[in-house]
């Protein structure tokens, strides 16, 4: 049998990805991160 | 608030043709993801599905009727029309249209049903 | 097509027992979607259906919460904690997952 009309079944959040780079000092190198709506995941 | 009715002949013939309107308010068919079915019941019997129609004119049908349904849209006068060819005394049933609407943010079932109205088909 | 299968057909119930209803599908009905399309309707007497249960257990707005849906796959159940005399009336299920949709027989809910 056809399946019957429906929408998917996720909706798509659209959000700004910013990866940024921060120098911590000359011993410790630098930091990468990622931060997803306003959040730092990375 | 949502309504539907339907409205047609309360008797029909044996081979004829019935025409049956669903005229509603409360919403629109111009709306995405709007849609607006039949169902028909036989006395004393279970429900049975026979056509859906949405807002982009994509139309669905229970194959047993195919043949014999059209289902279509006034989407300015807010009603659908419902046509069955060769009718039979078996299809003497209430016929109900019912919305139904598309979209995660909706409910995906049928929300609101008309008050039916019965067809008796008999020479 | 999915063939649903109610059962009982016929439920006597006391007013503040609990009631439950089956209905099997002869096919799974999960869509491609993920979502399964089991609802549930209740047709009281001279009146039209009216939608209790959606996507299997999410209540319809104003259906009171004595009123409960579960299940999965094909096994599909409608529990009502407490009956109450106006919840008389012909309860179906309905899958909207495969065309052509389909309702159970009904099951026929009755004060004892």
């Known amino acids: 049998d056809a399946e019957f009309r429906h929408d998917s079944g996720y909706e798509v959040h659209h959000q700004k990805l910013v990866f940024f780079a921060e120098d911590v000092g000359s011993n410790k190198g630098a930091i990468i991160g990622l931060m997803v709506g306003g959040v730092v995941i990375a | 608030q949502v309504t539907l009715k339907e409205s047609g002949p309360a008797l029909v013939k044996p081979t004829q043709t019935l025409t049956l309107t669903c005229t509603f308010s409360?919403?629109?068919?111009?709306?995405?993801?709007?849609?607006v079915g039949w169902i028909r019941q036989p006395p004393g019997k279970a429900l049975e599905w026979l056509a859906h129609?949405?807002?982009?004119?994509?139309?669905s049908y229970n194959p047993s009727l195919k043949s014999r349904l059209t289902i279509s849209k006034d989407t300015s006068k807010n009603q659908v029309v419902l046509t069955m060819t060769n009718m039979d005394p078996v299809d003497t049933a209430t016929y109900y249209c019912a919305r139904r609407q598309l979209g995660l943010r909706s409910i995906d079932a049928m929300d609101y049903w008309g008050q039916g109205t019965t067809v008796t088909v008999s020479s | 097509d999915v063939v649903m299968t109610q059962s009982p057909l016929s439920l006597p119930v006391t007013p503040g027992e609990p009631a439950s209803i089956s209905c099997r599908s002869s096919q799974s009905i999960l869509h491609s979607n993920g979502n399964t399309y089991l609802e549930w309707y209740l047709q009281k007497p001279g009146q039209s259906p009216q939608l209790l249960i959606y996507k299997v257990s999410n209540r319809f707005s104003g259906v009171p919460d004595r009123f409960s849906g579960s299940g999965s796959g094909t096994d599909f159940t409608l529990k009502i904690s407490r009956v109450e005399a106006e919840d008389v009336g012909v309860y179906y299920c309905?899958?909207?997952?495969?065309?052509?949709?389909?309702f159970g027989q009904g099951t026929k809910l009755e004060i004892k």
């Open positions: 129609i949405w807002w982009d004119d994509d139309k």
């Open positions: 409360g919403f629109s068919l111009s709306t995405s993801g709007m849609g």
């Open positions: 309905f899958q909207a997952t495969r065309v052509p949709l389909t």
